[in-house]
C-alpha cells in the first residue's frame, strides 16, 4: 500500500519511542565509529522532520524514501572522510547504490574498545540521573559493535535491560541482583547477534532461495500441524522481515515483524498449539516468544513420504511444473516428520533429492532411476549423528575448557593462517556446543549441535571475509551454505603451511594475568596454545598437553609468589626453554 509519506507512515505505525530507537540503531550500525552525541543529534533531527510529515504528508521532502532521508542525514557528518575513509565515497552515489555502499562497509569486527562494566553503584546512578540517555547508550553500544543485530529484537533486549536496572537498583544487594541479569543479557545478546548474522549472510551471499529453504525447514519442524500453504505464507513474510533488517530497512522490518506476530496469533489454530502463552504477551515479548517457541507435536499417522515423492507416477511432472514448490513440499513433509534432524541436514537431503530428480527426470526411465533416492540419505544422516556422538563423548571426558583446547588444536592445524584471536574466539564458541547440546537426549542433540555449529562457523566466515588469508576457509565458506560444517570437518592438517617463526615475546607473561577473571585467564592460555601449534603444527597431543600443563603450573606458582613479576620473568624464561626443548623448536 502506497503512502504519500513513508516516514510519516512508519512514525505513526511504530510510535515515537520505537521510531527513535530504531533510527538510532540504524545509524549506529552504519556509522560505527561516530560518537554517541553525534548520533543522538542526527536522530533528533530525523524525528523532528518525521513529526512535520505526520502533521502534513505533503510537506517538503516528506515524499522521499527512507533511504534517501537517512542517507542524506548520514552524509552530513562532517568527519566522514577522516573517520571512515573510502566509505565517504558512498555519499557521491544515488539511491539505491548509496545504501548498498553503506551496507558493504559494515564492519563485523570494528576497532572499538571492549565494553567495560562500571561498578554497580555508578551504573545505578547513571540510570537514575538520566534513564533515557542510559538506555539509548545501551542501544548505541550494542548496535555499533553488532552491525547486523536484529533491530526489533534489540528493542526487546533494551526493555529487559531497563527492567533489570529498575528492579535491582532498589534492591538491598544491588550487585547480586543485577550482575547475573547483565551476564545473561550479554550472553543471550551475543548468541542473538550471531544467529542473525547467519540469516543475513544466507540472504546476502546465497540469496533469497537459500533463506526460504532454511525457513521452510525450520518452520515445518516448529509447526508440523500447519498446512504447507500456511507454512509457505509464513516463510514469505519472514523472508521479507529479515531481508529488510539485513538491508538496513529497520523501520519497515520492525513494522512487518509486528504484523507477522499479529497474523500468527490471529491464526494460532491453523499454525500451532504452543503459541497461546506467547500471544498473551506485549508486542516485543510476543515476537521474541514466537521466535523461540518449542516445536508442536507431530500429527499422528502421517503417511510415508515415499508415496508422493518416489512411488507416484507424477513425480517428474510435478517437479517440472513448479520445481521450487515441489522441493518446498518435499522439505516441508520431511522436516515436519523430523524434529530430530538439524535444519542443515534437512537441506542436504532436499539438495540430494533435487539433484537426483534433475538427473533422473531427463533419463529414459525416470522412475527406475530415482527409485532408490531415499537410500542415498542414509550416509548423510549418519555422518552428523556419528560426529556428534564422538564429540559429546570427548566433551564428557574432558569438560568444556579442555574440549575447547582440543578444538583449538584441531582448527589451528586445519587453517593455521587464520588470526590467533579469531581462532580462539571461534574455537571457544565451537567448544560451547558441548555444554549447550550434549546434555540433550538423542532426539534433540543434532538440531541443537549442528545448527549451532552453523552459526559459529558463520562467525569464522564473516571475520575471514574481512581479511582473507586462507583459501581453504574461503572455499568452505563460499561453496555451499549447508555443507560448511562437513567441509570444515573434512579438512585435515594443512601440509602447505610454513610454521611461524618462534617469538619469545609471544610467550612472555606478566603479573597482570593473576588479576584476570577465570575466563580471561583461559583466553590467555588458549592464545598461547594456538601460537604453539602455529610454531609446531606437527606437535602431538601429548607434547602440547605437557607444555600446557607446565604453563598452567607456572601461572599458578607465580600468582602465589610474593614477587610475582620477578617470578614471571625468571620462571617464564625457564618455561620457554623447556617448551622449546619438549617441542623440538
Amino acid at each position: 500500500d502506497a503512502h504519500k509519506s513513508e516516514v510519516a507512515h512508519r512514525f505513526k505505525d511504530l510510535g515515537e519511542e520505537n521510531f527513535k530507537a530504531l533510527v538510532l540503531i540504524a545509524f549506529a550500525q552504519y556509522l560505527q565509529q561516530c560518537p554517541f552525541e553525534d548520533h543522538v543529534k542526527l536522530v533528533n533531527e530525523v524525528t523532528e522532520f518525521a513529526k512535520t510529515c505526520v502533521a502534513d504528508e505533503s510537506a517538503e521532502n516528506c515524499d522521499k524514501s527512507l533511504h534517501t532521508l537517512f542517507g542524506d542525514k548520514l552524509c552530513t557528518v562532517a568527519t566522514l572522510r577522516e573517520t571512515y575513509g573510502e566509505m565517504a565515497d558512498c555519499c557521491a552515489k544515488q539511491e539505491p547504490e548509496r545504501n548498498e555502499c553503506f551496507l558493504q562497509h559494515k564492519d563485523d569486527n570494528p576497532n572499538l574498545p571492549r565494553l567495560v562494566r562500571p561498578e554497580v553503584d555508578v551504573m545505578c546512578t547513571a540510570f537514575h540521573d538520566n534513564e533515557e540517555t542510559f538506555l539509548k547508550k545501551y542501544l548505541y553500544e550494542i548496535a555499533r559493535r553488532h552491525p547486523y543485530f536484529y533491530a526489533p529484537e534489540l528493542l526487546f533486549f533494551a526493555k529487559r535491560y531497563k527492567a533489570a536496572f529498575t528492579e535491582c537498583c532498589q534492591a538491598a544487594d544491588k550487585a547480586a541482583c543485577l550482575l547475573p541479569k547483565l551476564d545473561e543479557l550479554r550472553d543471550e545478546g551475543k548468541a542473538s547477534s550471531a544467529k542473525q548474522r547467519l540469516k543475513c549472510a544466507s540472504l546476502q551471499k546465497f540469496g533469497e532461495r537459500a533463506f526460504k529453504a532454511w525457513a521452510v525447514a525450520r518452520l515445518s519442524q516448529r509447526f508440523p500441524k500447519a498446512e504447507f500453504a500456511e507454512v509457505s505464507k509464513l516463510v514469505t513474510d519472514l523472508t521479507k522481515v529479515h531481508t529488510e533488517c539485513c538491508h538496513g530497512d529497520l523501520l519497515e522490518c520492525a513494522d512487518d515483524r509486528a504484523d507477522l506476530a499479529k497474523y500468527i496469533c490471529e491464526n494460532q489454530d491453523s499454525i500451532s498449539s504452543k503459541l497461546k502463552e506467547c500471544c498473551e504477551k506485549p508486542l516485543l515479548e510476543k515476537s521474541h516468544c514466537i521466535a523461540e517457541v518449542e516445536n508442536d507435536e507431530m500429527p499422528a499417522d502421517l503417511p510415508s513420504l515415499a508415496a508422493d515423492f518416489v512411488e507416484s507416477k507424477d513425480v517428474c511432472k510435478n517437479y517440472a511444473e513448479a520445481k521450487d514448490v515441489f522441493l518446498g513440499m518435499f522439505l516441508y513433509e520431511y522436516a515436519r516428520r523430523h524434529p530430530d534432524y538439524s535444519v542443515v541436514l534437512l537441506l542436504r537431503l532436499a539438495k540430494t533429492y533435487e539433484t537426483t530428480l534433475e538427473k533422473c527426470c531427463a533419463a529414459a526411465d525416470p522412475h527406475e532411476c530415482y527409485a532408490k533416492v531415499f537410500d542415498e540419505f542414509k550416509p548423510l544422516v549418519e555422518e552428523p549423528q556419528n560426529l556428534i556422538k564422538q564429540n559429546c563423548e570427548l566433551f564428557e571426558q574432558l569438560g568444556e575448557y579442555k574440549f575447547q583446547n582440543a578444538l583449538l588444536v584441531r582448527y589451528t592445524k586445519k587453517v593455521p593462517q587464520v588470526s590467533t584471536p579469531t581462532l580462539v574466539e571461534v574455537s571457544r564458541n565451537l567448544g560451547k556446543v558441548g555444554s549447550k547440546c550434549c546434555k540433550h537426549p538423542e532426539a534433540k542433540r543434532m538440531p541443537c549441535a549442528e545448527d549451532y555449529l552453523s552459526v559459529v562457523l558463520n562467525q569464522l566466515c564473516v571475520l575471514h571475509e574481512k581479511t582473507p588469508v586462507s583459501d581453504r576457509v574461503t572455499k568452505c565458506c563460499t561453496e555451499s551454505l549447508v555443507n560448511r560444517r562437513p567441509c570444515f570437518s573434512a579438512l585435515e592438517v594443512d601440509e602447505t603451511y610454513v610454521p611461524k617463526e618462534f617469538n619469545a615475546e609471544t610467550f612472555t607473561f606478566h603479573a597482570d594475568i593473576c588479576t584476570l577473571s577465570e575466563k580471561e585467564r583461559q583466553i590467555k592460555k588458549q592464545t598461547a596454545l594456538v601460537e604453539l601449534v602455529k610454531h609446531k603444527p606437527k606437535a602431538t597431543k601429548e607434547q602440547l598437553k605437557a607444555v600446557m600443563d607446565d604453563f598452567a603450573a607456572f601461572v599458578e606458582k607465580c600468582c602465589k609468589a610474593d614477587d610475582k613479576e620477578t617470578c614471571f620473568a625468571e620462571e617464564g624464561k625457564k618455561l620457554v626453554a623447556a617448551s622449546q626443548a619438549a617441542l623440538g623448536l
Epitope: A229, S232, C316, A322, K323, V325, A362
Partner: nanobody, 123 residues
C-alpha cells in the same frame, strides 16, 4: 499481469500434424515450468504435457506419448506443442498453462491459462 496467448489450432484430418505455439508475458518465463492441457467437448481438463524451465525435462500423458513433442524457446518466451499422427480423440481446445503461486501442483483449473486454441480432427 500474466498473459498466455495460444495459436496454431485448426481443422486437420486424422494422421495429420499441427504445431501449437504459446506466447507468454508478465512473468519470468525462463524460470517457469510450462504445461499443455486440453478440454474435449463436454469433458473436464486433461493434462497433455509438461516441460521444465530449462527444457531438460519433458513429460507426456500416455495417450499422446510418441506422437506429441513439447519444446520451448526461452529467448522468445514461447512454448510449442508439435502434434503428429493426430486422431479424432485429440479434438479439444488446447490451453497453455503455468503454475500459479498458492495453487496445488497439478490442479490445472487454478493455473494461469490462456484463452485456448481449438484443434479439430475429422475426416
Amino acid at each position: 499481469q500474466v498473459q498466455l496467448l495460444e495459436s496454431g489450432g485448426g481443422k486437420v484430418q486424422p494422421g495429420g500434424s499441427l504445431r501449437l505455439s504459446c506466447a507468454a508475458s508478465g512473468f519470468t518465463f525462463s524460470t517457469s515450468g510450462m504445461v499443455w492441457v486440453r478440454q474435449a467437448p463436454g469433458k473436464g481438463l486433461e493434462w497433455v504435457s509438461t516441460i521444465s524451465d530449462d527444457a531438460r525435462i519433458t513429460v507426456y500423458a500416455e495417450s499422446v506419448k510418441g506422437r506429441f513433442t513439447i519444446s520451448r524457446d526461452n529467448a522468445k518466451n514461447t512454448v510449442y506443442l508439435q502434434m503428429n499422427s493426430l486422431r479424432a480423440e485429440d479434438t479439444a481446445v488446447y490451453y497453455c498453462a503455468t503454475y500459479r503461486a498458492g495453487s496445488r501442483i497439478g490442479s490445472y483449473e487454478d493455473y494461469y491459462r490462456g484463452q485456448g486454441t481449438l484443434v479439430t480432427v475429422e475426416p
